[in-house]
Amino acid sequence: MMTGTIETTGNISAKKGGSVILQCHLSSTMAQVTQVNWEQHDHSLLAIRNAELGWHIYPAFKDRVAPGPGLGLTLQSLTMNDTGEYFCTYHTYPDGTYRGRIFLEVLESSVAEHSARFQIP
């Protein structure tokens, strides 16, 4: 029985060239979190945080992705191409799979209004 819910940072905006934290939080379940996957809009994996193995950042993103804080993910040196959907997938036992969605909009430096709660200056 999947009783949990995922809270995310929702729709966020960040400045081109800057950084942003993607954050999800699983609540309302006692399930064990064994792994968290971070994926981009085109289904490509950015990073995995495994309970035993720790973080694995996929090679294509090594230069621009930093693990954390917590189970979150920090995207650096943002480009306009980073605009789009990001998904956190929590693999848990005994519940199974929970998925959260974040929409990131990367704005030109001159336009950026920093609405993101987890924004890094």
Partner: antibody
Amino acid sequence: EVQLVESGGGLVKPGGSLKLSCTASGFTFSSYAMSWVRQSPEKRLEWVAEISSGGSYTYYTDTVTGRFTISRDNAKNTLYLEMSSLRSEDTAMYYCARKRRDYYGMDYWGQGTSVTVSS
Amino acid sequence: DVQITQSPSYLAASPGETITINCRASKSISKYLAWYQEKPGKTNKLLIYSGSTLQTGIPSRFSGSGSGTDFTLTISSLEPEDFAMYYCQQHNEYPWTFGGGTKLEIK
């Protein structure tokens, strides 16, 4: 080349025990969660058990909980399934399978080892 | 447990044809369905995962679609080596469960 080779199957009486092994090669065994899946004589597939990469987490289907134990020895690149209190409905071909690194499905399977529970 | 109903259980087709196999889950499994191919004397092969993502090394004539409760495996322009048994499996919640299988034979 990724290879998974099961062994240890055989004929056993109801209530008996058996220990299956699966020897892995061609990949970093300690980086992957592993599963046992069985196929009944009627060709139905059933997920049996799973173990995390380091062995800290083990999961079972309800029908085998308390009777089967999944374990692994990462130094020996080997996965195990210890089966006790065997029943006729446990008769099946038992396969070990590697879980994808991202946990989406099982990307490599062994050839299987046959277990028959009969008096 | 999530029940998976796979149809048809048997399918006869000719090389070059396009076929579809369906799987229906007893409740929503989001996009988390995998498809496998089973052939005698060979190890089971993962074809598709997460509903529509093609496993590395699998020919593009295999495709998957669907989300929620209804999923489809399509094999376009059948090759002789495609005649085999096919199974779907949900990887959304424990225990992982499989469909009953589809035997694809040459007409």
